[in-house]
């Protein structure tokens, strides 16, 4: 058993049929010695008396809010949560496996630049009695500070018969060094509590590996005289790291016909303009990627050829 | 060239070669996620690689103030990786074909280090840890780790030279 936060404790249980469970001793936080009784949740049934209460925790019915009283007055509470371990593996019932970029990916994170600011998100089908708490650091043995905000519900989607809820959190490295080569990964830890079930999820990454620039901005077309060619121009996204002579992007320009089956013409360039042939009913799209490190491409910015 | 007197390197040449290094490093090990190498053991093997750290003066301001600290750090790393890529880690099994980008990567690391340090001038270089894994799986794991680490190193070096070529070239 360990303390998650003040008066909230997590009991780690091997979860299999007829498991013996864990013996837990609760102590009433009071100077009083006599006349103390214990109850669980809303029940008025007295579970025991005395300053300590010893219980055998085997299942969710044994978890909950234990309260010690004296003469009708509440002295203190202890909330017990369960963390299940099945076949040596901690349960992952609360969050959905996003399966990208690989199986058992519960947390996904992205950064728009090298400032040390990043966003993580996760999915669940649970709508109520759900709380999350997020901690992060750079490295684990001698951790350097990363500050995370509160997790918030950022999207709701309908998937078949189920509703899916997306939560996200923003974090910022306290003393980020955008130009340095990272040698220690960022660690992100999410504590999830659903009713009386506790689970924790972790992710470890370098900012460089989760970079995804915003799409290029101000995408414009300039027709070239007496030609089907156009000059496409664009700018670096505002959110990208500066100076651009140091934090450079590379770009992919694509001409795509109306039909998905039509052949796509693609040009790669380090410049912020390109000359392409504009076909009727086609659209021109541009996306960006770090020039020197192959992290994710941005989403496309698009304009119609007409 | 970063000669003893501390004059400027051939920023544009260095920029071109460092950008080529980035491309080669990703050709040699294109996959980001097929093996989470930080989850594997053997941490000490790549902990000794020289990283370009915050105080090394490789940020835009540091380069403007005095690029020599940064260039020395980059040179140190280039020599370190060049030695690693020429070692048994990359010559043993699993077999690399002669068209492997590792060969070109090895030559380009040497080429860039020579651009930074002509004959006769010697910066201190870092000691290479003696790594000689006997098993193919250990060797391959080490290769992947070295290449992933090299990708990060050459990305910073390429940014330095791109910025230098754009803002510090005579």
């Amino acid at each position: 058993i360990w303390e998650l936060k003040k008066d909230v404790y997590v009991v780690e249980l091997d979860w299999y049929p007829d498991a013996p469970g864990e013996m837990v001793v609760l102590t009433c936080d009071t100077p009083e010695e006599d006349g103390i009784t214990w109850t669980l949740d809303q029940s008025s049934e007295v579970l025991g008396s005395g300053k300590t209460l010893t219980i055998q925790v085997k299942e969710f019915g044994d978890a909950g809010q234990y309260t010690c009283h004296k003469g009708g007055e509440v002295l203190s509470h202890s909330l017990l949560l369960l963390h299940k371990k099945e076949d040596g593996i901690w349960s992952t019932d609360i969050l959905k496996d996003q399966k990208e970029p690989k199986n058992k990916t519960f947390l996904r994170c992205e950064a728009k630049n090298y400032s040390g600011r990043f966003t993580c998100w996760w999915l669940t089908t649970i709508s109520t009695d759900l709380t999350f708490s997020v901690k992060s650091s750079r490295g684990s043995s001698d951790p350097q500070g990363v500050t995370c905000g509160a997790a918030t519900l950022s999207a709701e989607r309908v998937r078949g018969d189920n509703k899916e809820y997306e939560y996200s959190v923003e974090c910022q490295e306290d003393s980020a060094c955008p130009a340095a080569e990272e040698s220690l990964p960022i660690e992100v830890m999410v504590d999830a509590v659903h009713k009386l079930k506790y689970e924790n999820y972790t992710s470890s990454f370098f900012i460089r590996d989760i970079i995804k620039p915003d799409p290029p901005k101000n995408l414009q077309l300039k027709p070239l005289k007496n030609s089907r060619q156009v000059e496409v121009s664009w700018e670096y996204p505002d959110t990208w790291s500066t100076p651009h002579s140091y934090f450079s992007l590379t770009f992919c320009v694509q001409v795509q016909g109306k039909s998905k089956r039509e052949k796509k013409d693609r040009v790669f360039t380090d410049k912020t303009s390109a000359t392409v042939i504009c076909r009727k009913n086609a659209s021109i799209s541009v996306r960006a990627q770090d020039r020197y490190y192959s992290s994710s491409w941005s989403e496309w910015a698009s304009v119609p050829c007409s | 060239r970063a000669v003893p007197g501390g004059s400027s390197p051939a920023w544009t040449q260095c920029q071109q070669l460092s950008q080529k290094l980035c491309t080669l490093a990703w050709s040699a090990h294109p996959l980001v996620g097929h093996m989470d190498l930080r989850e594997e053991g053997d941490e000490e093997t790549t902990n000794d690689v020289p990283h370009i750290q915050c105080g090394d003066g490789c940020d835009p301001q540091g380069l403007r103030d005095n690029s020599q600290f940064c260039l020395q750090r980059i040179h140190q790393g280039l020599i370190f990786y060049e030695k690693l890529l020429g070692s048994d880690i990359f010559t043993g099994e699993p077999s690399l074909l002669p068209d492997s980008p590792v060969g070109q990567l090895h030559a380009s690391l040497l080429g860039l280090s020579q651009l930074l340090q002509p004959e006769g001038h010697h910066w201190e270089t870092q000691q290479i840890p003696s790594l000689s894994p006997s098993q193919p799986w250990q060797r391959l794991l080490l290769r992947f780790k070295i290449l992933r680490s090299l990708q990060a190193f050459v990305a910073v070096a390429a940014r330095v030279f791109a910025h230098g070529a754009a803002t510090l070239s005579p």
């Epitope: - | 050709s27 040699a28 090990h29 294109p30 996959l31 097929h34 093996m35 099994e93 699993p94 077999s95 690399l96 074909l97 002669p98 068209d99 492997s100 980008p101 590792v102 060969g103 098993q135 193919p136 799986w137 060797r139 391959l140 794991l141």
Partner: antibody
Framework: QVQLVQSGAEVKKPGSSVKVSCKAS????????IHWMRQAPGQGLEWIGY????????KYNENFKGKVTITADKSTSTAYMELSSLRSEDTAVYYC?????????????WGQGTLVTVSS | DIQMTQSPSSLSASVGDRVTITCKAS??????VAWYQQKPGKVPKLLIY???TRHTGVPSRFSGSGSRTDFTLTISSLQPEDVADYFC?????????FGSGTKLEIK
């Protein structure tokens, strides 16, 4: 896109020789090794060897040394595999293939195969 | 030479079944193993490399696992179009060698 086009089927007498060609297009011919494999009827694949056109250096499976000669013609972007002293057990489909760009020998692109039949 | 012992040599399964093919290397090949699918009269097609990485465009029902000497190709839910021969291949050591193949049929 990358393409490997092999020469047509051959029927040969025991003791004779055969030269199979593999014309490459869609990439820089001298940049990559070209490998040869064979597959006898109803059997698995056997790796024969490769040529690296950049320096014309071949490497052979010891089991085929003296039996096979692999060459390349840079001017036509074509690789050749010559089999000598043919025997009935050399009857097989012969494939050329090129590996991944990372320098390891898993094969992404294959020729369509050339059936060599050795029969008296 | 490294022997790649593939089993079973043939196998019949129903549509929707989970199918597993194994390959045993005679010595350590790290994860330098690829899997190919060959349909009748066609050329081999790369499915998996580095023991577990799916090649571009290969359906997610195909997965590979294993390291050092023991490797597995799994088809999570067999489809009619999966009828083919399957080969493993080690590219760790010269001469590169292939398994003898598994003929997969639909019941």
């Amino acid at each position: 896109q990358v393409q490997l086009v092999q020469s047509g089927a051959e029927v040969k007498k025991p003791g004779s020789s055969v030269k199979v060609s593999c014309k490459a297009s869609g990439y820089t011919f001298t940049d990559q090794t070209i490998h040869w494999m064979r597959q006898a009827p109803g059997q698995g694949l056997e790796w024969i060897g490769y040529i690296y056109p950049r320096d014309d250096s071949p490497k052979y499976n010891e089991n085929f040394k003296g039996k096979v000669t692999i060459t390349a013609d840079k001017s036509t972007s074509t690789a050749y595999m010559e089999l000598s002293s043919l025997r009935s057990e050399d009857t097989a489909v012969y494939y050329c293939a090129i590996p991944d760009r990372s320098g390891y020998a898993w094969f992404i692109y294959w020729g369509q195969g050339t059936l060599v039949t050795v029969s008296s | 030479d490294i022997q790649m012992t593939q089993s079973p040599s043939s196998l019949s399964a129903s549509v929707g079944d989970r199918v597993t093919i194994t390959c045993k290397a005679s010595r350590d090949v790290a994860i330098a193993v690829a899997w190919y699918q060959q349909k009748p009269g066609k050329v081999p097609k790369l499915l998996i490399y580095w023991a577990s990485t799916r090649h571009t465009g290969v359906p997610s029902r195909f997965s590979g696992s294993g390291s050092r000497t023991d490797f597995t190709l799994t088809i999570s839910s067999l489809q009619p179009e999966d009828v083919a021969d399957y080969f493993c291949h080690q590219y760790s050591s010269y001469p590169f060698t292939f398994g003898s193949g598994t003929k997969l049929e639909i019941k």
